[in-house]
Amino acid sequence: LEASEEVELEPCLAPSLEQQEQELTVALGQPVRLCCGRAERGGHWYKEGSRLAPAGRVRGWRGRLEIASFLPEDAGRYLCLARGSMIVLQNLTLITGDSLTSSNDDEDPKSHRDPSNRHSYPQQAPYWTHPQRMEKKLHAVPAGNTVKFRCPAAGNPTPTIRWLKDGQAFHGENRIGGIRLRHQHWSLVMESVVPSDRGTYTCLVENAVGSIRYNYLLDVLERSPHRPILQAGLPANTTAVVGSDVELLCKVYSDAQPHIQWLKHIVINGSSFGADGFPYVQVLKTADINSSEVEVLYLRNVSAEDAGEYTCLAGNSIGLSYQSAWLTVLPEEDPTWTAAAPEARYTDKLEFRHDSGLNDIFEAQKIEWHE
């Protein structure tokens, strides 16, 4: 959106679907006139949940959002809701900028860096352009993770950014792996964090007019090894009609690399269990967590034979976890009948150790999953 004198969406027509969500950068002192809907039938404008009055410096009137002279406190989220239906017609975020160029998704100019094609604007102290990206002040992350701190800012002249750790200049020279500074992104990135990275990180943004700073707190959590955690309730009991497709989901959380197997409990010679008391199972799918789709078991065109108990089994270097669910398959001709499948069993009773693979787990624990 280019604007030489004011930010304006014209004519005052209902926005296209592509217009519904926009982010506009507005220069301080710049008038704003945004339209939503048709004149008398225009929508109501709200800022941060409060409806704008039809009079005043910032007003919502006949479908228009009008700001006489844009101030820093005018930045924020603006919604235009259709009269009566409360349908969102416009979803705008106004951001304080330092040039008379309003940015949209196609162009995100930072032309204030090149004053040759600019008018002369008054100097301005630094200010945060995207404070919503700075809301997370405390970063508590596991050791080995990547951490990113951001302090997007602007000002005139364009400010510089530098970083402090615990009040001291921080360039990362003493940090294994160093740091990554992207000045155009106003960001500091540290990969593979370790406990010695804990501390207070300060971004200091300054220009000739003034300076601003913001503190982030980093806590590095030392990993406590544990066997995989399976999200409760997954896989879930499922009822399907013959011929339909079924997806069983298993969400696995594990610091150590987990291996996952999907098992179907089967009956051999009329029995579900072997003489040793362990169940007969068929391995349907096996892979590690990084494999595509491993946490989802797809059953295509199910038949009555697919009904039964399914188990998601996950193991890592620490141990093993597994949970089961039942699939009930209904005949095609009677889709209204519903069977009460047994409760999903959280079969997580045993502690296991792990040697080198799931089969070794079973061997080591004498768990003979008969196939």
Partner: antibody, heavy 119, light 107 residues
Framework: EVQLLESGGGLVQPGGSLRLSCAAS????????MSWVRQAPGKGLEWVSV????????HYADSVRGRFTISRDNSKNTLYLQMNSLRAEDTAVYYC????????????WGQGTLVTVSS | DIQMTQSPSSLSASVGDRVTITCRAS??????LNWYQQKPGKAPKLLIY???NLQSGVPSRFSGSGSGTDFTLTISSLQPEDFATYYC?????????FGQGTKVEIK
């Protein structure tokens, strides 16, 4: 209109070198970070390298670090990728892409240039 | 590096269907996730940036959600031109890794 046009691809032997170029137009080139992204035949997208608008920052994927060098000439509105010690696994279509400010999303892409590494 | 895992790797759907593709990061990446669409022989096209923001010119039937490690791309009503491969990409770490892709095919 934003346009990105890659060139310089072709057939090269393992161990050889190639220099790709990406000519940009329709926007203030120096205001934007630029990246190279590649796609091996029948495979997915792999990010290769990025360079900040003022060339103050570069970064590389582990698979190419030490062999590839990204650079730019803002006076010519051109992005480059110097590829040395090429391997068969570097065979791919190479795209240059513009980074959307702040979000590091690639909002404009070139049409790609094919690099084939084979003896 | 941060790994991105997409699921499913392929799916079959019909015009008008609601389609959901998921992407999981190996660690918290805040909302630093983008979605792209790619058709055979063409360059990718940006659909969603920063997890939930619709790129200019992209139809509103596309939407993105999620933060942290789990993200979703939803096509509310699949259109003929939407049959393509979709990729997620994280930009939290310096190496902007992509997911392996999800191919959406006609049923």
């Amino acid at each position: 209109e934003v346009q990105l046009l890659e060139s310089g691809g072709g057939l090269v032997q393992p161990g050889g070198s190639l220099r790709l170029s990406c000519a940009a137009s329709g926007f203030t080139f120096s205001d934007y970070a630029m990246s190279w992204v590649r796609q091996a035949p029948g495979k997915g997208l792999e990010w290769v390298s990025v360079i900040e608008g003022d060339a103050s920052y570069t970064h590389y994927a582990d698979s190419v670090r030490g062999r590839f060098t990204i650079s730019r000439d803002n006076s010519k509105n051109t992005l480059y990728l110097q590829m040395n010690s090429l391997r068969a696994e570097d065979t791919a279509v190479y795209y240059c892409a513009r980074e959307r400010t702040y979000s590091s999303a690639f909002d404009y892409w070139g049409q790609g240039t094919l690099v084939t590494v084979s003896s | 590096d941060i790994q991105m895992t997409q699921s499913p790797s392929s799916l079959s759907a019909s015009v008008g269907d609601r389609v959901t593709i998921t992407c999981r990061a190996s660690q918290d990446i805040s909302s630093d996730l983008n979605w792209y669409q790619q058709k055979p022989g063409k360059a990718p096209k940006l659909l969603i940036y920063d997890a939930s923001n619709l790129q200019s010119g992209v139809p509103s039937r596309f939407s993105g959600s999620g933060s942290g490690t789990d993200f979703t791309l939803t096509i509310s009503s699949l259109q003929p031109e939407d049959f393509a491969t979709y990729y997620c990409q994280q930009h939290y770490s310096p190496s902007h890794t992509f997911g392996q892709g999800t191919k959406v095919e006609i049923k």
